[in-house]
Interface confidence: low
Amino acid sequence: IPTEIPTSALVKETLALLSTHRTLLIANETLRIPVPVHKNHQLCTEEIFQGIGTLESQTVQGGTVERLFKNLSLIKKYIDGQKKKCGEERRRVNQFLDYLQEFLGVMNTEWIIES
Amino acid sequence: IPTEIPTSALVKETLALLSTHRTLLIANETLRIPVPVHKNHQLCTEEIFQGIGTLESQTVQGGTVERLFKNLSLIKKYIDGQKKKCGEERRRVNQFLDYLQEFLGVMNTEWIIES
């Protein structure tokens, strides 16, 4: 898979492959994988990819199922790159406060908050 | 501040306090703080709260500015609690795949993806 494929297209293709291979992936009935208990997915990327690793290690590889896991590893690469960009640029307090305000605004309107 | 205040109310109050104290907070013109260069805020919570710590250490405390930083530390506590819940429950592969599909779906529709 060329890594030049836009990440948005990669995500779409991965969703399709996930549906295609669902039956194969759920074949192991004894396996248990940690699943986050809330919907703030971005907070849980490490655990999600750990679970993907668990799943990959016990799934017979070959054909498009291999492509599914390759895609997922490229998505992880993208997210790791995004995480790197969290602290790369030093700016004035003003700009930091803009970002903080935006973060709290998103938390206020979009997060699923259980008190 | 009683920690019993619902997190959603805490976030709203913090947004208001941030506006109130903006002038005081930007007084230090030489300070530089790492600011994420993308809008997937949840990926950057660690860096955001590090920046808040930097800001707090150089802001004259007292009155409601103290309340602002107290609120922010309670919000951090809430987020840390959410992060703990990322890997606490082991479920069947089926349920993990549901979560993964949901995560990719959110990534597909809500993330700001630059390729």
């Epitope: 490490e46 993907i52 690793g53 992880k76 | -």
Partner: nanobody, 132 residues
């Protein structure tokens, strides 16, 4: 059927040594996995002592055992060891080995304090008692 069997527990004097072993059999997955050593003292929560990825890389040690405990492995026999030196009375606990097929995706095996809930397979435990 995956089985983990610990051995090597027993009694020791403070300052003494013990070597625990864990044999993994029936592991159904190809490739490497995360191996963890945990302990649980009476009335306390199970805590991570050491963890490492069997394919290599760093090993995590709890602060309380750093410099005293070391892990090793014998790939040919799928046996894992926990060498415990300079034992202290507070090391008294039931010790468990655990395995889970994390791949390097997670990245945190051997780096972070291992969460017991992240491990699929467990041994039955071996008792270690350290007297002063």
């Amino acid at each position: 059927q995956v089985q983990l069997q610990e051995s090597g527990g027993g009694s020791a004097q403070a300052g003494g040594s013990l070597k625990l072993s864990c044999v993994v059999s029936g592991y159904p997955y190809s490739g490497d996995y995360c191996m963890g050593w945990f302990r649980q003292a009476p009335g306390k929560e199970r805590e991570g002592v050491a963890a490492f990825y069997t394919g290599g890389g760093s090993t995590y040690y709890a602060d309380s055992v750093k410099g005293r405990f070391t892990t090793s492995q014998d790939n040919a026999t799928s046996t894992f060891h926990l060498q415990m030196n300079s034992l202290k009375p507070e090391d008294t606990a039931t010790y468990y080995c655990a395995a889970d097929p994390w791949s390097v995706y997670g990245g945190s095996c051997g780096v972070k304090d291992p969460n017991p809930k992240a491990f699929n397979y467990w041994g039955q435990g071996t008792q270690v008692t350290v007297s002063s």
